[in-house]
């Protein structure tokens, strides 16, 4: 994401079209309080960040309110008055949707429909991953609304499920982030379980975008 300028690496995350987080990693300035200056219009004066992120007592990022904005963020990271990194980016291409909420499971024989609250914006994929203790990998199914039906399940097996939201790559590009996963829930014979006992620890999910 961030080309290096004077050894500065940046990362931008636009959380749920609400808050933009810009973080930096500047080895040359590791013991320095760099300042973050920004604007949303190319001809405005820069404002200084009022909500810094700190790492080991020094500034390492900035959080900005930017609700529902498809704007270019113009920003400058400075050491005193000296800019060490200046750039501008369309924020929306760094979207990270929020984690699915109100996840529900509706069972019918060998199939389950997983639903959750759709986010207020579109061009998203809702992905359900699931596995039984007998599966070596997580299986995955996704739809463009949070209404995902998985068929061909074995009613006698215990299944673990979790859900996340991803931005469609052909719309938002390759630099977005999937949401955090919802909590894992376990089901057997259409009933919720504390855990699928046969697996002491579930394997890591596929991290495919």
């Amino acid at each position: 994401q961030g080309g290096a300028a004077e050894g500065v690496q940046i990362q931008i995350i636009y959380f749920n079209l609400e808050t933009v987080q810009v973080t930096w990693n500047a080895s040359k300035y590791s013991r320095t309080n760099l300042t973050f200056h920004y604007r949303f219009n190319g001809d405005e004066a820069y404002d200084q960040c009022t909500n810094y992120l700190l790492q080991e007592g020094h500034t390492s990022g900035c959080l900005l309110d930017a609700e529902q904005r498809d704007d270019i963020l113009y920003f400058s990271i400075r050491n005193g008055t000296h800019p060490v990194f200046t750039a501008s980016r369309w924020m929306v291409y760094y979207l990270k949707p929020s984690s699915p909420k109100h996840v529900r499971f509706s069972w019918h024989q060998d199939a389950v429909t997983v639903t959750c609250s759709d986010l207020s914006y579109g061009d998203l994929l809702y992905e359900v991953q699931y596995r039984s203790p007998f599966d070596t990998e997580w299986q995955s199914k996704q739809e463009n609304t949070c209404n995902v039906t998985i068929e061909g399940l074995d009613a006698e097996k215990c299944y673990s499920f979790w859900v996340r939201v991803k931005a469609m790559e052909d719309v938002y590009g390759p630099d977005t982030y999937p949401s955090d996963w919802s909590e894992v829930t376990c089901w057997q014979r259409g009933e919720i379980r504390d855990a699928c006992a046969e697996t002491p620890t579930p394997p890591k999910p596929k991290l495919s975008k």
């Epitope: 080309g3 079209l17 498809d70 750039a87 061009d123 052909d170 590009g173």
Partner: antibody, heavy 125, light 106 residues
Framework: QVQLVQSGAEVKKPGASVKVSCKAS????????ISWLRQAPGQGLEWMGW????????RYAQGFTGRFVFSLDTSVSTAYLQISSLKAEDTAVYYC??????????????????WGQGTLVTVSS | EIVMTQSPATLSLSPGERATLSCRAS??????LAWYQQKPGQPPKLLIH???TRVSGVPDRFSGSGSGTDFTLTISSLQAEDVAVYYC????????FGQGTKLEIK
């Protein structure tokens, strides 16, 4: 289908003003931003900025502040570009254009799928 | 600003030949690159976005490649209707265009 229809060619004297219109149809006007671009004769394309059709908020690219004003009349799904104190170097074809992909927020985001036919503005004494 | 440089300025090829158009960005634009085709008296037409993704309805003889600073538009078998000026455009930040490559038929 989506259409952007621009007003006709204009010939103006230096120092005058011009207002170019861009009427949108075939979609909900307030769900996509409108960008303005210009192309001087025999030259490449320059992005002038964009206007949020939901809020009316304009964003001007560097070099296009002061004499250039973006405005809207949402009741007739029309965006406007006004240029004041015209100079000979403003002679160009002016295009309105619309993002074609992101429906998430009312933005521009830089990829122009739908274009007006262009309006030639000639500034000559 | 990010400066986009296209080469060659003019490309003259015979029908059926392969056309390779290059575009270089003055700094990394990741994959935020589009290609447009412009015919005389018409507005530009978007062909490719995200450097490699063909827009719906664009013939599959058009393909894009590259990321970072170096990009290529390839027309696998040139046809008479492909005569036009081709522009690359970055949209990592506020959009900037290359100066164009004029594609001619010999």
């Amino acid at each position: 289908q989506v259409q952007l229809v621009q007003s006709g060619a204009e010939v103006k004297k230096p120092g005058a003003s011009v207002k170019v219109s861009c009427k949108a149809s075939g979609y909900t006007f307030t769900t996509y931003g409108i960008s303005w671009l210009r192309q001087a004769p025999g030259q490449g394309l320059e992005w002038m900025g964009w206007v949020n059709t939901n809020t009316g908020n304009p964003r001007y690219a560097q070099g296009f502040t002061g004499r250039f004003v973006f405005s809207l009349d949402t009741s007739v799904s029309t965006a406007y570009l006004q240029i004041s104190s015209l100079k000979a170097e403003d002679t160009a074809v002016y295009y309105c254009a619309r993002e074609g992909f992101i429906t998430t927020v009312v933005g521009a985001a830089g990829r122009f799928v739908y274009w007006g036919q262009g309006t030639l503005v000639t500034v000559s004494s | 600003e990010i400066v986009m440089t296209q080469s060659p300025a003019t490309l003259s090829l015979s029908p059926g030949e392969r056309a390779t158009l290059s575009c270089r960005a003055s700094q990394s634009v990741s994959s935020s690159l589009a290609w447009y085709q412009q015919k005389p008296g018409q507005p530009p037409k978007l062909l490719i976005h995200w450097a490699v993704t063909r827009v719906s309805g664009v013939p599959d003889r058009f393909s894009g490649s590259g990321s970072g600073t170096d990009f290529t538009l390839t027309i696998s078998s040139l046809q008479a209707e492909d005569v036009a000026v081709y522009y690359c455009q970055q949209y990592s930040t506020y959009p900037t265009f290359g100066q164009g490559t004029k594609l001619e038929i010999k």
